[in-house]
Structure formats: structure tokens, C-alpha cells
Interface confidence: low
């Protein structure tokens, strides 16, 4: 009888211990869940900083190449360029790197998608209309909205093979390129209206980039 009591006591202790183990385990799991949310928030914040850096650099660059910059005195232009270069330098001191974990197939898909975009950029730097239509078909392939033009099906299947974060980056890169083309287009239209050696030089520069 005493033995039975002892056994019962021991079993009681074992069950108590295992239930506290379960509590501890679920508490740890809860903590990890909370941490996972914070890790994702950290990655999102870092990605946002990365994007902000890109946007700032793009804006500084577009100011330096704006039509207004051509219509001010050399002295003012020099001063503004110094400020712009200083801002660019300070922006570049911010280094953020958000690594994406990819499997080999996603790695290949990313490489392929990047190569396609690079090829378009290299081929059409002097040919904005064509660049735009080609990039639009690539952009439509990444967009969830109803496309406004042809969707590049082949590119779409490649992008689908990329990691989700890479898909977003590809889409952002295409948006940036299309924005740049839009700006270049406006600049060239303005230049076509103005006469002079300056526009001729720019035209020659543009024409030296086909492939």
C-alpha cells in the first residue's frame, strides 16, 4: 500500500513536470513567434531604408540632369552640383543589405530575370520608345493589376520562379527604369524644341549606346 502511495506520488510529480514542460515549450514558442514578427519587421524596415536610399539617389540624379539645371548660370550650377554631390556622398554612406534566402532554382530564375532586364537596358538606351514598350511588357508580367499591354509570358514564368522578395525587387527595378525612361523622354522632347550645340551633344551621346 505504501509502495502504491509512493508510486502515485512519483507519477504525480512526473505529470506535473511534463505539464510545466509543455507550458515552458509553448511559452518559448510564443516568444519565437513574437521574435519572428520582429525579425520580419526588421527586414521590412531595412528593405524600406534600402528603397529610400535608391529613391534619394534617383532624385538627386534627376535634379542634376534636369532641364532647370541647364537654364541657370555656370556659377549657380556649380554650387548646386556641389550640394547635390555632397548629398549623394552622404546617402552612399548608408549601407543596408537585406539578403534573400534562395534555393538553387530561385537563384537561377533571378539570374535569368536580371539578364533579361539588363539586355533590354543595354539594347535600348538610345531608343526610348522601344525600351518603354519592351519594359512595359516585362512590367505587366510582374503586375497583379490588369495589364495595359502585352504580357511577356516567358518572363512571367521566370519571375514566378523567383523568391517572393526578388519578385518585388524585380518589379521595383522595372518601375524605376520606366520612370527614368519617362524622364529621359521629357528631357529629349524639351531638347528637340531648343536649338544649339548642347542638344546636339546630348543626341550624339544618346546615339552611342545601342547594344
Amino acid at each position: 500500500m505504501a509502495q502504491a502511495k509512493i508510486n502515485a506520488k512519483a507519477n504525480e510529480g512526473r505529470f506535473c513536470r511534463s505539464s510545466s514542460m509543455a507550458d515552458r515549450s509553448s511559452r518559448l514558442l510564443e516568444s519565437l513567434d513574437q521574435l519572428e514578427l520582429r525579425v520580419e519587421a526588421l527586414r521590412e524596415a531595412a528593405t524600406a531604408v534600402e528603397q529610400e536610399k535608391e529613391i534619394l539617389l534617383e532624385m538627386i540624379h534627376s535634379i542634376q540632369n534636369s532641364q532647370d539645371m541647364r537654364q541657370i548660370s555656370d556659377g549657380e550650377r556649380e554650387e548646386l552640383n556641389l550640394t547635390a554631390n555632397r548629398l549623394m556622398g552622404r546617402t552612399l554612406t548608408v549601407e543596408v543589405s537585406v539578403e534573400t534566402i534562395r534555393n538553387p532554382q530561385q537563384q537561377e530564375s533571378l539570374k535569368h530575370a536580371t539578364r533579361i532586364i539588363d539586355e533590354v537596358v543595354n539594347k535600348f538606351l538610345d531608343d526610348l520608345g522601344n525600351a518603354k514598350s519592351h519594359l512595359m511588357s516585362l512590367y505587366s508580367a510582374c503586375s497583379s493589376e490588369v495589364p495595359h499591354g502585352p504580357v511577356d509570358q516567358k518572363f512571367q514564368s521566370i519571375v514566378i520562379g523567383c523568391a517572393l522578395e526578388d519578385q518585388k525587387k524585380i518589379k521595383r527595378r522595372l518601375e524605376t527604369l520606366l520612370r527614368n525612361i519617362e524622364n529621359s523622354d521629357k528631357a529629349i522632347k524639351l531638347l528637340e524644341h531648343s536649338k544649339g550645340a548642347g542638344s546636339k551633344t546630348l543626341q550624339q551621346n544618346a546615339e552611342s549606346r545601342f547594344n
Epitope: H112, R115, I116, N122, S137, E207, N211
Partner: antibody, heavy 122, light 112 residues
Framework: QVQLVQSGAEVKKPGASVKVSCKAS????????FYWVRQAPGQRLEWIGY????????TYNRKFKGRVTITVDKSASTAYMELSSLRSEDTAVYYC???????????????WGQGTLVTVSS | DVVMTQSPLSLPVTLGQPASISCRSS???????????LHWFQQRPGQSPRLLIH???NRFSGVPDRFSGSGSGTDFTLKISRVEAEDVGVYYC?????????FGGGTKVEIK
Amino acid sequence: QVQLVQSGAEVKKPGASVKVSCKASGYSFTDYTFYWVRQAPGQRLEWIGYIDPYNAGNTYNRKFKGRVTITVDKSASTAYMELSSLRSEDTAVYYCARGYYRYGGGGDFDYWGQGTLVTVSS
Amino acid sequence: DVVMTQSPLSLPVTLGQPASISCRSSQSLVHSNGNTYLHWFQQRPGQSPRLLIHKVSNRFSGVPDRFSGSGSGTDFTLKISRVEAEDVGVYYCSQNTHIPPTFGGGTKVEIK
């Protein structure tokens, strides 16, 4: 295998237009662009322009702007080059050649059609 | 437009001997992407041009290894290590870095 087959020889009067076709086979038609090049007697090869069959975007050599139109018919896997306001100096052999690959490097004049002789004479 | 200058204009060679053709461009053919789009073509009598070498030194598929290309910037060379009877024809260099793509005037290779 890749083949580009062009339409037959043409004789035209000055001021007229000519349309040369180039039928592609042996590869995915919209994956590569098309170049058009001509070779006049005693002259060097001269690039006329190109077209991307995927979106029909094209670029022309400034020298031919306003006189040349390059088009494609995707359903027939055929590219066309039309030259208007012909003059005697347009007498040449006109070639189509496969251009670059849309999905990465490669291409660039790697396959050529057999050529189409266009004679402009009054 | 970029002017491509080839030399010599005519190249009489002995079968089995080497041959070398030079091509010079009026401006650098190095693209901002780092590639150099300089190609070499062979045109046999009565035939269409045929791609031999693309991007300076890459032999196109099916091209015999006696053909080789080299050079950089504005100076390029096509070499035939041992000329064979079937190599007779006109050889052209071409640049596709700048628009419009342009071609050299050609070098006629003939057997002595």
C-alpha cells in the same frame, strides 16, 4: 535548323515602293529580333533597321527614316521590309538577318536570309 | 556613324599559309556594359554573309578553329591559321555597339 527564306527578286521603277519578306523557321519567332541589311554593288553592307517581333517595336537607320517600314506578321513568322520612293541608288541585294535574343545575349547577325535583289530602273 | 576601316583591301594567300585581316573603328567599341560588339563575317562568292566570330573572339557554332579573332578598343584582327580553298571570299568586320551598326569595306581573300 534555323532558316530565313526571303522573297524573290524585284524590278521597280524610280518613285515606286518595294516590300521584301523574310520567313523564319527552326526557332521561336518572337524570341529574336530581325535586322535588315542591304548590299549595293561595290558598296559596303549597310544596316537599314530592326524590329522586335514580340512587341513590333522598331528602330531605323537615320539614313532611311521616312522611307523604310519594317513590320512583322507573327502568325506567319514573317518579317517585312518596305522601302518607298525608290531611286536608282537603292539597287542592291537586301538581306534579313536574325538579331539578338530577347532573353539574354546571343544572336546578332547569326543567321542570314539568301538575299533579295531589288533593281530600280526606269 | 562609326566608320570601320579594314586592311588590306585584297589578300592573296598561299594554301596552308596563315592570313591576317585588320579592322579599325573610328571610336571605341567597348560598350558601357563592358562588352565589345565586334563581329567578323565571311561572304563566299554568290552567297549571303555568314557569322564567323562574335564579340571579338567567340567562334560561332560550326566555324573551324583555324579562324580566330582578337583585339580591343578600336583595333581588331581576324586570323586564319592555315588558309584552305573554301576560305576564298570577302571578309567583313562589323560593330554593333553603336547605332547604327556599321560594316567594314571588306577584305577579299584569294588564292595565289
